[in-house]
Interface confidence: low
Amino acid sequence: EKLPKAPVITTPLETVDALVEEVATFMCAVESYPQPEISWTRNKILIKLFDTRYSIRENGQLLTILSVEDSDDGIYCCIANNGVGGAVESCGALQVKMKPKITRPPINVKIIEGLKAVLPCTTMGNPKPSVSWIKGDNALRENSRIAVLESGSLRIHNVQKEDAGQYRCVAKNSLGTAYSKLVKLEVEVFARILRAPESHNVTFGSFVTLRCTAIGIPVPTISWIENGNAVSSGSIQESVKDRVIDSRLQLFITKPGLYTCIATNKHGEKFSTAKAAATVSIAEWSKSQKDSQGYCAQYRGEVCDAVLAKDALVFFNTSYRDPEDAQELLIHTAWNELKAVSPLCRPAAEALLCNHLFQECSPGVVPTPMPICREYCLAVKELFCAKEWQAMEGKAHRGLYRSGMHLLPVPECSKLPSMHRDPTACTRLPYLDYKKENITTFPSITSSRPSADIPNLPASTSSFAVSPAYSMT
């Protein structure tokens, strides 16, 4: 008769290294009488006998993981118990080794010069792979702009044209190396004018060539504007070399003009634009023809887009250095001030301000702006915005709110031409024509003041200020 013997583990478990999808085996040799019951745990959780990912053989002494996954790593223990003495335990670690794998490869990137580019390269592997990058055929050197981040991603600060090219990331550990596909980093450069057209003073009927050179990636297109409109006459010759576009506009000069070269290129959904302008003046051009203070052009802004008539020509005042931008800024500022006014006043005030700042324009030898008709101005002032106007005038007269940022460019109604004197000399506000049907107290459409000589332009504007602290309601 054999004597009972408490279990003794004769081959303690050891650390097992295994590759993903390979087999891993733990041996737990036990001596005892009677034969012990052997159970296995992973990270202190019992492994079920019927779990098909494992095979338990040799009376439970052999545990085999049939196809190792990276989630299988952990501490495996065998526990032997035969009722004699206490249970005994031996533990060992499974270290899942894995060849490098690129889980998030880099993708093609288009980036604007000067911005920051990040090319991702997320990896898996055990031991943890080291990540390096190749540009073209050479290993990429890190510097103060270019760095491989902890995650493996490549970060390039202040991207330069020279950074364009083909990149791939390389993940390496003791078990192997993984390469990403080649990806392309394209560096886009805002359009920039290298050579601006020069101004000319010529005799009537002579030919002039204006030249404009621009650079950018992609290569910009160049368009020419004459007094705010697309050039209607003249011939354009263009050549492109090494991302530089050279455009020459040849003109037959019969009137003076402001010619603007506009270089544009596209970056995704957005465009970048560079402008340069030159004047062509005619020697001994008569005084009356010199009096024009601006040009006619289509409105290309955003603020008044819904208010102004589609495709209408409006007047841009060349006393501003950049008329279109300056007038848009003025209306933008005014628009913000109008956020506080009543729902009745606001649309009427918007129509008034847009049509006052962007007056209808009659092109011709001397572009002529057309002011708003006096009656429409008075309708806004005395009906739609009466309360706001009174409050505003009261504040202005007491010397309050002189801050230039909060000035509203409001026309002085009394100085505007009457539609009854000459209906073609002033602009109607369609918004008010449409609204007046619904308003019974519409002011009389004759001026409340004695008729006077009506100047062609508002001689001045009175600017009233609305402080953000003061609500026009």
Epitope: G114, L115, K116, R141, E142, N143, S144, A147, V148, L149, E150, R155, H157
Partner: antibody, heavy 118, light 112 residues
Framework: QVQLQESGPGLVKPSETLSLTCTVS????????WTWIRQPAGKGLEWIGR???????DYNPSLKSRVTMSVDTSKNQFSLKLSSVTAADTAVYYC????????????WGQGTMVTVSS | DIVMTQSPLSLPVTPGEPASISCRSS???????????LDWYLQKPGQSPQLLIY???NRASGVPDRFSGSGSGTDFTLKISRVEAEDVGIYYC?????????FGQGTKLEIK
């Protein structure tokens, strides 16, 4: 979390070389710029230079001829050497991490006082 | 190098009152990516500096919301809406646009 600790002699003789080491604990030294900044007693802060974990450096032009920085990624340390020191180099020397997500020094050491005197 | 100029150099404040520090740079710190490369730091007595505001107006983590940064280009302001006793120290602005990074002379905030 990441902590920085400066170490080195507190007293250096004129014309000798000042050597300081900054040890990064609680995180990796990888993928950041590591910077040295100094502050003479009662005065403002002066940026000395920076080193990236790859070893690339940028120095303040006013000190460039005398400064050398190095990095030991295996020890999670970076160091500063300033040669031919004079009394004007007496200051508290700080090491700091430059976080280029925020373009700012987000972690600083507590500083070490270095006196240049014979 | 970009020169940073702070004012005032000394700022006595009553607890609970607001405080404002100005910082001016010798050239614009507005990058064409839209960020202003200006940071604010506070050095409390006997301590190393700590980051308050980065990129002009972003509060660093753990910084109370009574601190705010504003400005663009060459003129920047650090505001403390209600000064507390723990806010005493020297405040520095720093430009992060160019190497070498340069700091302002510092503004010493004291409690009245």
């Amino acid at each position: 979390q990441v902590q920085l600790q400066e170490s080195g002699p507190g007293l250096v003789k004129p014309s000798e070389t000042l050597s300081l080491t900054c040890t990064v604990s609680g995180g990796s030294i990888s993928s950041y710029y590591w910077t040295w900044i100094r502050q003479p007693a009662g005065k403002g802060l002066e940026w000395i230079g920076r080193i990236y974990t790859s070893g690339s450096t940028d120095y303040n032009p006013s000190l460039k001829s005398r400064v050398t920085m190095s990095v030991d990624t295996s020890k999670n340390q970076f160091s500063l050497k300033l040669s031919s020191v004079t009394a004007a180099d007496t200051a508290v020397y700080y090491c700091a991490r430059y976080n280029w997500n925020d373009d700012a020094f987000d972690i600083w050491g507590q500083g070490t006082m270095v006196t240049v005197s014979s | 190098d970009i020169v940073m100029t702070q004012s005032p150099l000394s700022l006595p404040v009553t607890p609970g009152e607001p405080a404002s520090i100005s910082c001016r740079s010798s050239q614009s710190l507005l990058h064409r990516n839209g960020y202003n490369y200006l940071d604010w730091y506070l050095q409390k007595p006997g301590q190393s500096p700590q980051l308050l505001i980065y990129l002009g107006s972003n509060r660093a983590s753990g910084v109370p919301d009574r601190f705010s940064g504003s400005g663009s280009g060459t003129d920047f302001t650090l505001k403390i809406s209600r000064v507390e006793a723990e806010d005493v120290g020297i405040y520095y602005c720093m430009q992060a646009l160019q190497i070498p990074h340069t700091f302002g002379q510092g503004t010493k905030l004291e409690i009245k």
